[in-house]
């Protein structure tokens, strides 16, 4: 029978690294880290860690029994757990039956949004105490809210991950800006900065109808030329308070109606860390 | 039944590079590793190198790391050694040699002999 | 890299005879060790891998022992076809190295 591997989680030292030996298995040739998906009751889904290692082809591989890895986790808080991947048979050959080296894989380790990720695997038994074994180490970084698949996680929604402001922008004179766009029922407050090098002209906006989408209007005063400027839209939503998903625009002159005219160039851009 | 048959005897001037075939048969080609080990005229043998014909990964013995290429080719179940710079020690044959579950050699090539002469 | 001594480089032995070879690694090889037959002009042929285990189609009159660096190649009763080079090689982990060889002649 090919070997597979049994994963259980293991905090402390391995016992092996109590014991003298002789001789240990190599290195691992390869590890790598991608992200997937997993749904969850909530209707939600959970975003895990895929962890894959390769063997080294050679028979220093008659000696693993297991692989450990750890994982080490650094946002606003640091997080560490570790697991232990027993092989469920010895190793008769140095790659597999078909052809290539023997890879496995453990999926796992909870991701959490915009956390950078430090991935450690080892052989058992290793080195002995005061020695230092042959180890594996990646890093990987977890995408924010703006993600093509963490977009969708319920506290990315609640940040604002899927709404589009629809942000147009037009300069009125001289000393106005016209700033619409499409509110949420996320969220009743919204900032409203025009930037043009330097901030030019911000105002509050209050939506009070927060349960349906309105299209707000406000009128901003800027002291410099807004033509060109930078519109930057920041909603205020209790999930993530002032480090809500900003968006942006850009301000055109209005046509002679006064009527705004739409943008395609609206943009999106994570306020900070996202939640 | 497997077999590994290499191609014919050289003559090269030292400076030169030789290319060496071994076409295998009678077992899965990407399944095990090809070793290449060379003897002197009246010496022992000495291992070259190794390739993994699944995805091309290549050892080498650091004696011979600058000179030596492996490569292969799974269209038709053939592996290639090809040696640079040949010098006149660099004559011996040369044989292929297929790992078995692990870097013992279970099946040979009949061996290439290669000339270096000016 | 390991190193591989053989002993004796030569021998002289009659049909029927007792023939120990032996080989020492450089370091703990872990039983990864295999025999060949070599004979003037072939390939060399596997006789044994993993110390004890004989190939295909090798005859019952070879064996292997040891562990750690000392190994041995017995050949129980030799046969006229048994005059030939035999080589000692170790798999534990590239670079491979092989023994000097031990060249059995007939007496």
């Known amino acids: 029978r090919e070997p597979t591997v049994q994963c259980g989680s293991e905090t402390g030292p391995s016992p092996e690294w109590m014991l003298q030996h002789d001789l240990i298995p190599g290195d691992l040739r390869d590890l790598r880290v991608e992200p997937v998906t997993t749904s969850v009751a909530t209707g939600d889904y959970s975003i895990l860690m895929n962890v894959s290692w390769v063997l080294r082809a050679d028979a220093s591989i008659r000696l693993l029994k297991a692989t450990k890895i750890c994982v080490t986790g650094k946002s606003n808080f640091q997080s560490y757990s570790c697991v232990r991947c027993n092989y469920t048979e010895a190793f008769q050959t140095q790659t597999r039956p078909s052809g290539g080296k023997w890879t496995f894989s453990y999926i796992g380790f909870p991701v959490e949004l915009n956390t950078v990720y430090f991935i450690g695997a080892h052989n058992i038994p290793n080195a002995n105490m005061n020695e230092d074994g042959p180890s594996m180490s990646v890093n990987f970084t977890s995408p924010g809210c703006l993600d093509h698949i963490m977009k969708y996680k319920k506290k990315c929604v609640k940040a604002g991950s899927l709404w589009d402001p629809n942000i147009t922008a037009c300069k009125k004179n001289e000393e106005t800006v016209e700033v619409n766009f499409t509110t949420t029922p996320l969220g009743n407050r919204y900032m409203a900065l025009i930037q043009h090098s330097t901030i030019i002209g911000f105002s509050q906006v209050f939506e009070p109808h927060q349960k349906k989408q309105t299209r707000a209007s406000v009128v901003i005063p800027v002291t410099g030329d807004s033509e060109g400027a930078t519109v930057q839209l920041t909603p205020y939503f209790p999930t993530c308070g002032s480090d809500c998903i900003r968006h942006k625009g850009t301000v055109v002159l209005c046509p002679q109606t006064g009527v705004p005219f739409p943008l395609d160039n609206n943009k999106s851009k994570p306020g900070g860390w996202l939640p | 039944e497997v077999q590994l048959v290499q191609s014919g005897a050289e003559v090269k001037k030292p400076g030169a590079s030789v290319k060496v075939s071994c076409k295998t048969s009678?077992?899965?080609?990407?399944?095990?590793?090809m070793n290449w080990v060379r003897q002197a005229p009246g010496q022992g043998l000495e291992w070259m190198g190794r390739?993994?014909?699944?995805?091309?990964?290549?050892q080498y013995n650091q004696k011979f790391k600058d000179r030596v290429t492996l490569t292969r080719d799974t269209s038709i179940s053939t592996a290639y050694m090809e040696l640079s710079r040949l010098r006149s020690d660099d004559t011996a044959v040369y044989y292929c040699?297929?790992?078995?579950?692990?870097?013992?050699?279970?099946?040979w090539g009949q061996g290439t002999l290669v000339t270096v002469s000016s | 890299d390991i190193q591989m001594t053989q002993s004796p480089s030569s021998l002289s032995a009659s049909v029927g005879d007792r023939v120990t070879i032996t080989c020492r690694a450089s370091e703990n090889i872990n039983s990864n060790l295999a025999w060949y037959q070599q004979k003037p002009g072939k390939a060399p042929k596997l006789l044994l891998y993993?110390?004890?285990n004989l190939a295909d189609g090798v005859p019952s009159r070879f064996s292997g022992s040891g562990s750690g660096t000392d190994y041995t190649l017995t050949i129980s009763s030799l046969q006229p076809e048994d005059f030939a080079t035999y080589y000692c090689q170790h798999f534990w982990g590239p670079p491979y190295t092989f023994g000097g060889g031990t060249k059995v002649e007939i007496k």
């Open positions: 993993d110390v004890t």
């Open positions: 009678g077992y899965t080609f990407i399944s095990y590793w």
């Open positions: 390739i993994d014909p699944y995805d091309s990964e290549i």
């Open positions: 040699a297929r790992s078995g579950g692990f870097d013992w050699f279970a099946y």
